[in-house]
């Protein structure tokens, strides 16, 4: 069961896995959640009754019964990992800790104007896990305004001490705020010959890459495939680092693949979620349970529902045995990866999907696109919402996109004449407008946030956020779309779709069924030629066919221009304006969302 609250003055007895240092109990809970085996923890806060060397210790614990005996102890704070919970979790930690010195290897020292600048420096440095900044009130004159970048093997401090007039904090790489280059290439027939910081077993190079991405010290990796000549190294995933952050030596070797940590493009792809099945593959590990199951999918469900299960192997039933049910072996290991991988024994293996919630919800695979046709099917665009106004009568006003459990991104021009958020209703999971009746549930709008530089759609800044009164529970028919990552500015999107209930021609009416059209992006230069009387800025993006025929139109405003890249859908544009609809050589103009990511994050995380 999911227990989120912290237990004050309480210590869990026994079950210790390891001890780390964290600046708060809240962060100790996050560390526990991300640790492959931790289910419970005890954190020691600073207290006069407690030995200062034990302050800020975070003891990670495991238990077969998922609980441990409780003992009263002043200054101890205990709790449970979020592994048992179904809600979204994130390693992103923007907190700044005053008067705390987080110890690690100080590998870079420079002057910074503020703690924020120091944190940005840490976020944009490939090795940095956390930092300590000496403020201008720091007693020692020569250390004032010094920004120390630090790293450790675990990504957490080796110790934390009280120190007046300093502040500490963590890198914001896991908040998708790094400007570091995102290197997505995987190099076949390549071995990176740098120092190994760790090694694990993995079924393929993609899982190896994902493990590297969430390993604190890994910057790049080499994976030996199952055809690798040396049998003992098959399926071995070597996690690597180097002083420069890049591999120093590249050796051409057949049946090996190498690649990079995706820590600086984190929110564009699933990192924790290994959802594939591996046929004719057995994962070895500590056995948790053996259960009968009808299929490998059912086995994966059983593993996902068993909180301690990390991976599984399913052996299909022999003909007519056990009512056609096979054996489902639920397994675990110290690091979350199989201890060995064997091939040719007929098993089907895979991983728990429990960790998928550690990825941004928006990366979850959705229904495959329906090719051909213009009407959408249910669940095809689960981030699309219909925004209604109730004044003077209820009607569809604009489209919008779910980007968070309390946030809708839409166009500013939708709110011309809207006096109050009270007259707005947001409907999600809707395919046909006719589904919306008196009793259809909707989300009320608490606040409309319009970009303060917005004047009119044609001059840009046509972007607005709606804060909902209640949170959206994600399901197959209502879930968020990923924002484009700033590191992906150079991506050329080729699979883009515009959706909405808007007109199908200039003089028309709102459509009942959600419509979709695949539309190619047009360069801003090309777009500018088509709109001589307007200024097409880099904060706009255009899409359309030269011959016209497919476009957004009245009523689609505020809705998404969704582009699929690396199997993940991104909200590349917001339907904004255009000359007529689907006219020849008149592309649609959309708000270029990547240019507003900072604005969106600032507004949605202000609370």
């Amino acid at each position: 069961e999911c227990v989120t609250q912290l237990l004050k003055d309480t210590c869990f007895e026994g079950g210790d896995i390891t001890t780390v240092f964290t600046p708060s109990a809240k962060y100790c809970q996050v560390v526990c959640t991300y640790h492959p085996r931790c289910l419970l923890f005890t954190f020691t806060a600073e207290s006069p009754s407690e030995d200062p060397t034990r302050w800020f210790t975070c003891v990670l614990k495991d238990s077969v019964t998922e609980t441990l005996p409780r003992v009263n102890r002043t200054a101890a704070i205990s709790g449970y990992s979020f592994k048992q919970c179904s809600h979204q979790i994130s390693a992103c930690n923007k907190d700044i800790y005053v008067d705390l010195d987080m110890k690690g290897i100080n590998y870079n020292s420079s002057v910074a104007k503020s703690a924020q600048e120091c944190q940005e420096r840490c976020t944009d440095d490939v090795h940095c896990h956390f930092f300590t900044y000496a403020t201008r009130q720091f007693p020692s004159l020569e250390h004032r305004n010094i920004c120390l970048l630090k790293h450790t093997q675990t990504g957490t401090p080796t110790r934390i001490t009280k120190l007046d007039k300093v502040v500490s904090g963590f890198s914001l790489k896991s908040c998708a705020l790094s400007n570091l280059a995102c290197i997505r290439d995987i190099f076949p027939n390549t071995v990176f010959a740098d120092s190994n910081i760790d090694s694990v077993m993995a079924p393929d190079a993609f899982v190896c890459g994902r493990i590297c991405t969430h390993h604190p010290g890994c910057l790049f990796f080499t994976f030996f495939s199952q055809e690798w000549p040396k049998e003992s190294q098959r399926n071995l995933c070597l996690l690597k680092t180097s002083e420069s952050g890049l591999p120093s030596t590249r050796i051409k070797k057949s049946k090996a693949l190498s690649g990079f940590s995706l820590q600086s493009c984190r929110h564009s792809i699933p990192v924790f979620c290994h959802s594939s099945f591996y046929h004719d593959t057995d994962f070895l590990g500590e056995e948790l349970d053996i259960v009968a199951a009808k299929s490998h999918e059912a086995c994966q469900k059983l593993c996902t529902n068993a909180v301690r299960c990390q991976f599984f192997t399913y052996t299909p039933a022999q003909a007519s045995c056990n009512e056609g049910k096979g054996k489902c072996y639920l397994k675990l290991s110290s690091n979350g990866s199989p201890t060995k991988i064997l091939h040719g024994r007929g098993g089907i293996s895979g991983y728990t999907l429990r960790l998928c919630k550690m990825d941004n919800e928006c990366t979850t695979k959705i229904k495959p696109r329906i090719v051909g046709g213009t009407a959408s099917v249910r669940g095809e665009w689960p981030w699309q919402v219909t925004l209604h106004t109730t004044s003077p009568t209820q009607r569809h006003l604009c489209g919008g996109s779910i980007i968070g459990n309390q946030w809708i991104l839409t166009a500013a021009h939708c709110f011309y004449g809207v006096e109050s958020p009270k007259i707005l209703r947001v409907y999600s999971g809707i395919l046909n407008q006719s589904e919306i009746k008196e009793d259809t549930s909707f989300f009320g709008v608490q606040e409309i946030i319009i970009h303060d530089q917005y004047k009119m759609a044609e001059s840009g800044y046509d972007i607005a956020l709606l804060k909902l009164e209640t949170t959206v529970n994600y399901t197959d028919s209502q879930r968020p779309i990923c924002l484009p990552s700033k590191g992906d500015r150079n991506v050329i999107y080729t699979d883009c779709w515009v959706t909405g209930w808007g007109y199908r021609k200039l003089r028309d009416k709102i459509q009942n069924t959600l419509q979709k059209a695949k539309i190619p992006l047009v360069t801003n230069e090309e777009c500018q030629k088509r709109y001589r009387g307007h200024k097409i800025t880099h904060k706009m993006i255009c899409a359309g066919y030269r011959e016209g025929g497919k476009d957004a139109c009245k009523g689609d405003s505020g809705g998404p221009l969704s582009c699929k890249h690396n199997e993940v859908w991104h909200l590349v544009g917001i339907t904004s304006w255009g000359e007529g609809c689907a006219q020849r050589e008149r592309p649609g103009v959309y708000t270029n969302v990547v240019e507003y990511v900072d604005w969106i994050l600032e507004k949605t995380q202000a609370v």
Epitope: N179, I183, L246
Partner: nanobody, 124 residues
Framework: QVQLQESGGGSVQAGGSLRLSCAAS????????VGWFRQAPGKKREGVAT????????YYADSVKGRFTISQDNAKNTLYLEMNSLKPEDTAMYYC?????????????????WGQGTQVTVSS
């Protein structure tokens, strides 16, 4: 000693094209971030385009996307910048630069080796 030598700059009409080259000595392009930066009079130096030479990863400033193309020839240890549809606002001194390690691709502060620059002037 690392030396970067740019060439190919010049004057061109708006809408025209130029191809800049950067030859490196004492530094291998085979596994590094190398790129083009520019500085217009009275303005800060800004990133134009960068390439991670081991793979296919390229990074462009928004203002040049779709118009400029960065490429490399590892055998010749040379970096190129193909500039099409040039605009008056592209007028600047263009520098070739190379980094040491994994960097923010368009941040000049992260690049340690610099060429002398080549002037590009675009008139309307």
């Amino acid at each position: 000693q690392v030396q970067l030598q740019e060439s190919g700059g010049g004057s061109v009409q708006a809408g025209g094209s130029l191809r800049l080259s950067c030859a490196a000595s004492g530094y291998t392009f085979s596994n590094n971030f190398v790129g083009w930066f520019r500085q217009a009079p009275g303005k800060k130096r800004e990133g134009v385009a960068t390439i991670y030479t081991l793979g296919s990863s390229t990074y462009y400033a928004d203002s040049v996307k779709g118009r400029f193309t960065i490429s490399q020839d590892n055998a010749k240890n040379t970096l190129y910048l193909e500039m099409n549809s040039l605009k008056p606002e592209d007028t600047a001194m263009y520098y070739c630069a190379a980094a040491r390690g994994w960097v923010s691709p368009l941040d000049p502060a992260r690049f340690v080796y610099w060429g002398q620059g080549t002037q590009v002037t675009v008139s309307s």
